[in-house]
Amino acid sequence: LRLLDFPAPVCAQEGLSCRVKNSTCLDDSWIHPRNLTPSSPKDLQIQLHFAHTQQGDLFPVAHIEWTLQTDASILYLEGAELSVLQLNTNERLCVRFEFLSKLRHHHRRWRFTFSHFVVDPDQEYEVTVHHLPKPIPDGDPNHQSKNFLVPDCEHARMKVTTPCMSSGSLWDPNITVETLDTQHLRVDFTLWNESTHYQILLTSFPHMENHSCFEHMHHIPAPRPEEFHQRSNVTLTLRNLKGCCRHQVQIQPFFSSCLNDCLRHSATVSCPEMPDTPEPIPDYMPLWEPRSGSSDYKDDDDKGSSHHHHHH
């Protein structure tokens, strides 16, 4: 979690002098409670917006908006604390609106916005706006919270953000998978414009089950520049297990901007239409066991052969 570095955030508006300050998320009014405190925010809304940094990078940001209730407690409102909590990491970032002048009622409802919290793709957040000073320990709460889901890099607008592009969102491999015969699977995909290697992860499943009956990893070496954007094809040899017919192919790139954490693309081949009397899967069907210290997938030589070449 971080704040956008540009432009400088502004909270002042007509009729209100205000400045935005970094906050420890522990306002002084927690420690030294006041007798008179303002009511809670009204109509808190969080939306996904996009903003450019000074360097021209595009980031997703949480656009936070709320209004004030039309009661006399605005006379005691000294500011607001905005808090964003990333739910999985438990990381919290806060800023404080410090009012430098007293609020007065006027013809329109007071409305505040803030769009400087940078958020991550595919993450979940809780956004809280606390009016300041915070209430005494047993006082009515004067904050409002809302949860906020940030889409992943498949989302059209997210795809072109800097964090998504860094993880390879612009690469569309357009995978096609074709069963050549009971023992061979052909995978075609488009290479990206980077001299980096790829891995093809094949996982096969019985017709109606989610437990794999065959797994295989195939390494594709880095293409030469003249092969960029070309189609590459690989023929994978399957273990001949009856009923092990649903194949999921996942392609993992290793781009320099994301290394082991690049977006993966996958395609699935369904089992052929079942005959009226399907043959049962034998009890003794061998399932591989990982060697100690190995990755999730065994080496090619344990899995039958495979070969590939690039189309020009």
Partner: antibody, heavy 116, light 107 residues
């Protein structure tokens, strides 16, 4: 392929405890939280709470507070939900699901029967 | 807590028909709403999140709409595999809550 595989069915006596496991695979375990949802026979879905797989932080439904504990073991990419002081109305299918707000992948469910 | 109310409780329809399911929140949940499909003996399957975004692999015949307190799940042409129970869920605030479900059965 993202998968959440849960432990098998359990039969427990009232007052006992049950611990259900949920083994995750196919993604980086610590990148997402794990939520737990239960469903009594013939009834709807009830949110029980979540645990952050990254920080271990938890958020439990108020009605289960004090009786439920959610934990994770990152070395085995497994989440656990323990429910204590079981009552007959805890009889349900217990599901684990990936994420803390929107549940994009679910386990197959674990039937917990509480009966004397 | 936010109460989610689904209607109708049961819907009897024929394959090929257009189906509209309703979900109402007791207070605004913005667009923080998901829809799930559940068949007997199976875990719920995500269909829609953020009120209108289809989950991965969900056919285009499923669509979601609405914001604030009123939401709709529409199945444009019901297929035989769509007969199931459908649940809405809000994730705007804690505790997360589900609707009671709408059972879509064969007429």
């Amino acid at each position: 392929q993202v998968q959440l595989v849960q432990s098998g069915a359990e039969v427990k006596k009232p007052g006992a405890s049950v611990k259900v496991s949920c083994k995750a695979s196919g993604y980086t375990f610590t990148r997402y939280g794990i939520s737990w949802v239960r469903q009594a026979p013939g009834q709807g879905l009830e949110w029980m709470g979540w645990i952050s797989a990254y920080s271990g932080n938890t958020n439990y439904a108020q009605k289960l507070q004090g009786r439920v504990t959610m934990t994770t073991d990152t070395s085995t990419s497994t989440a656990y939900m323990e429910l204590r002081s079981l009552r007959s109305d805890d009889t349900a299918v217990y599901y684990c699901a990936r994420r803390q707000l929107y549940f994009d992948y679910w386990g197959q469910g674990t039937l917990v029967t509480v009966s004397s | 807590e936010i109460v989610m109310t689904q209607s109708p409780a049961t819907l009897s329809v024929s394959p090929g028909e257009r189906v509209t399911l309703s979900c109402r929140a007791s207070q605004s949940v913005s667009s923080n709403l998901a829809w799930f499909q559940q068949k007997p003996g199976q875990a719920p399957r995500p269909l829609i999140y953020d009120a209108s975004t289809r989950a991965a692999g969900i056919p285009a015949r499923f669509s979601g709409s609405g914001s604030g307190t009123d939401f709709t799940l529409t199945i444009s042409s019901l297929q035989s595999e769509d007969f199931a129970v459908y649940y809405c869920q809000q994730y705007d605030n804690w505790p997360l809550t589900f609707g009671g479900g709408t059972k879509v059965e064969i007429k």
